[in-house]
């Protein structure tokens, strides 16, 4: 068990001409709130996929009012971190959705508003109990910059958050066979109480002899990969029982990292992430010094001057991990903007821009008006050498070609369903309620339970609201 | 979180008139739909009035012509004007809040209006 923590650190123009217009306004003051939603692994999900590893809510941020005439700045921010609660192992890989929501405050007709501002989103790696990892991610023209980190809460330790701790039982030293539990060196790791031969890559347990596996891996010790299709014909008489081809064993099984690595398949083979002051193809090479010349790609070693004491290696730009023996993928990040091609070229990076757009991160769009019609009826309009649409009612998105859901904030209260209407929305509400968005129960105590509302209410009745 | 402090109640003749008032402690009252109810001895809490952050109004029935509900958000304040009073609108009179920030509903303490000759 454990929490992922992200922090938001600005949200604003990005850099390059075409700046977004502010949110919000001297008629429409607004606040920012953040929703995350994290998946595990790194599959490419749709937005609306549930959010498996869990998903958290900002407090709302202070009013915001535009100034006049000023360029729309870093916008005023919700205090504290987001917070997302895991109950299992953290997964290492994982996808996560950022979204940054816009709440009008307005007196404006249908009272407050939300509206999504932005959507970012990315598959990362990610190891429980690492330091903060930074990020900037683009949507359009807005740029949010934050950081995460994954921390397990004891006694779990460990890149996974399997390992568990206990205090120390003599004062001086752990146990045969058991390490100190960095970085609570007061505590012992506990000894393993998994089945035995449970996989350590791919099961964890958090009762003594059970093996539970991560997503992904399946069987009693969690070392047969879950097939991604569904078998049809069975091969030889070995699999009649199931009619499926029974995978071989994967590179990570019975895991070849030592010393506390963890496993990773690559295509040809297999990789082992190190615990610091361990490197080799296995981390089999231990006692390593800032003599040993353990940083890679021009890193910088400092401390380590004995084997007790562990370095570490300042990496230059464009590596990372432990040792620097990782090469940033810094089009992960996705710089290119309006749909530009990643290229990194080592030295560099390069955006191949999608026609009609140029510029070092194809931020230009070239086309501005011309040529480029809003959809459904929305008029464009032109500015700083990019277009925009104005959108008629009922349709939003860059070219109007997204129908804009008034239903999707939730608008009516107490279970009472919302219908969008081409003027607005109606709230059809439960026996019991009633007000134009079911705010108001007839009979507080048991307003669920009524079967109808007195003569003259309806609460059943859509109210609308517009 | 949200507090309800009503004032206005008292006693009143059959036909006269009472306005009743309720201060919100809340920074954003224009987030929240507001409403008054009342309970008479030995009856349920019932609706009497409510008007929505977007400044719909409902009634119930009994008191449609008599009663008026209104809000002004710069005074963080929502009253209900009663005339015509009559014996059966006797009750204590609640000051009913729902926020549509934390989506939940707050009441106030009550005041006591007694129409009686």
């Known amino acids: 068990a454990g929490v992922f923590e992200l922090q938001i650190h600005s949200f604003g123009p990005g850099p390059g001409p075409g700046a977004p217009r502010s949110p919000c306004s001297a008629r429409l003051p607004c606040r920012l709130f953040f929703r995350v939603c994290l998946k595990p692994g790194l599959s490419e999900e749709a937005a609306e996929s549930p959010c498996a590893l869990g998903a958290a809510l900002s407090a709302r941020g202070p009013v915001y009012t535009e100034q006049p005439g000023a360029p729309a700045p870093d916008l005023p921010l919700p205090d504290g971190l987001l917070q997302v609660p895991f109950r299992d192992a953290w997964p290492g890989t994982f996808s996560f959705i950022i979204e940054t929501w816009r709440e009008e405050l307005g007196d404006q007709i249908g009272g407050p508003a939300w509206s999504l501002l932005a959507r970012v989103a990315g598959r990362r790696r990610l190891a429980a109990g690492g330091p903060w990892a930074r990020d900037i991610q683009r949507a359009g023209a807005w740029e949010l910059r934050f950081s995460y980190r994954a921390r397990c809460e004891p006694p779990a330790v460990g890149t996974a958050c399997t390992r568990l701790c206990r205090p120390r039982s003599a004062p001086s030293r752990c146990g045969p066979g058991l390490r100190p539990c960095a970085p609570l060196e007061d505590e012992c790791e506990a000894p393993l109480v998994c089945r035995a031969g449970c996989s350590p890559e791919h099961g964890f347990c958090e009762q003594p002899g059970e093996c539970r596996c991560l997503e992904g891996w399946t069987g009693p010790l969690c070392t047969v990969p879950v097939s991604t299709s569904s078998c049809l014909s069975p091969r030889g008489p070995s699999s009649a029982t199931t009619g499926c081809l029974v995978p071989g064993p994967g590179p990570c099984d019975g895991n070849p990292c030592a010393n506390g690595g963890s496993c990773s398949e690559t295509p040809r083979s297999f990789e082992c992430t190190c615990p610091r002051g361990f490197y080799g193809l296995r981390c089999e090479v231990s006692g390593v010094t800032c003599a040993d010349g353990p940083c890679f790609n021009g890193g910088l070693c400092v401390g380590g001057a004995d084997p007790d004491s562990a370095y570490i290696c300042h990496c230059p730009p464009g590596f990372q991990g432990s040792n620097c023996e990782k090469r940033v993928d810094r089009c992960s990040l996705q710089p290119c903007r309006n749909g530009g091609l990643c290229l990194d070229l080592g030295h560099a990076l390069r955006c191949r821009c999608r026609a009609g757009f140029a510029g070092p991160r194809c931020e230009h769009d070239l086309d501005d008006c011309a040529g480029r019609a809003c959809a459904n009826g929305g008029t464009c309009v032109e500015g700083g050498g990019a277009h925009r649409c104005s959108c008629a009612l009922g349709f939003g998105g860059r070219d109007c070609r997204e129908r804009a859901d008034p239903c999707a904030a939730r608008p009516c209260a107490h279970g009472g369903r919302c219908y969008a209407h081409f003027s607005g929305l109606v709230c059809a509400c439960a026996p019991g309620y009633m007000g134009a968005r079911c705010e108001f129960p007839v009979h507080p105590d048991g307003a669920s339970a009524l079967p109808a509302a007195p003569p003259g209410l309806r609460p059943g009745d859509p109210q609308r609201y517009l | 979180e949200v507090q309800l402090v009503e004032s206005g109640g008292g006693l009143v003749q059959p036909g006269g008139s009472l306005t009743l008032s309720c201060a919100a402690s809340?920074?954003?009252?224009?987030?929240?739909?507001l409403a008054w109810y009342r309970q008479a001895p030995g009856k349920k809490r019932e609706l009497v009035a409510g008007i929505s952050d977007d400044g719909s109004i409902v009634y119930m029935d009994s008191v449609k012509g008599r009663f008026t509900i209104s809000r002004d958000n710069a005074k963080n304040s929502v009253y209900l004007q009663m005339n015509s009073l009559r014996a059966e609108d006797t009750a204590v009179y609640y000051c009913?809040?729902?926020?549509?920030?934390?989506?939940?509903?707050?009441w106030g303490q009550g005041t006591l209006v007694t129409v009686s000759s």
């Open positions: 809340s920074s954003s009252v224009s987030l929240l739909s």
């Open positions: 009913y809040a729902y926020s549509w920030i934390t989506r939940s509903p707050y």
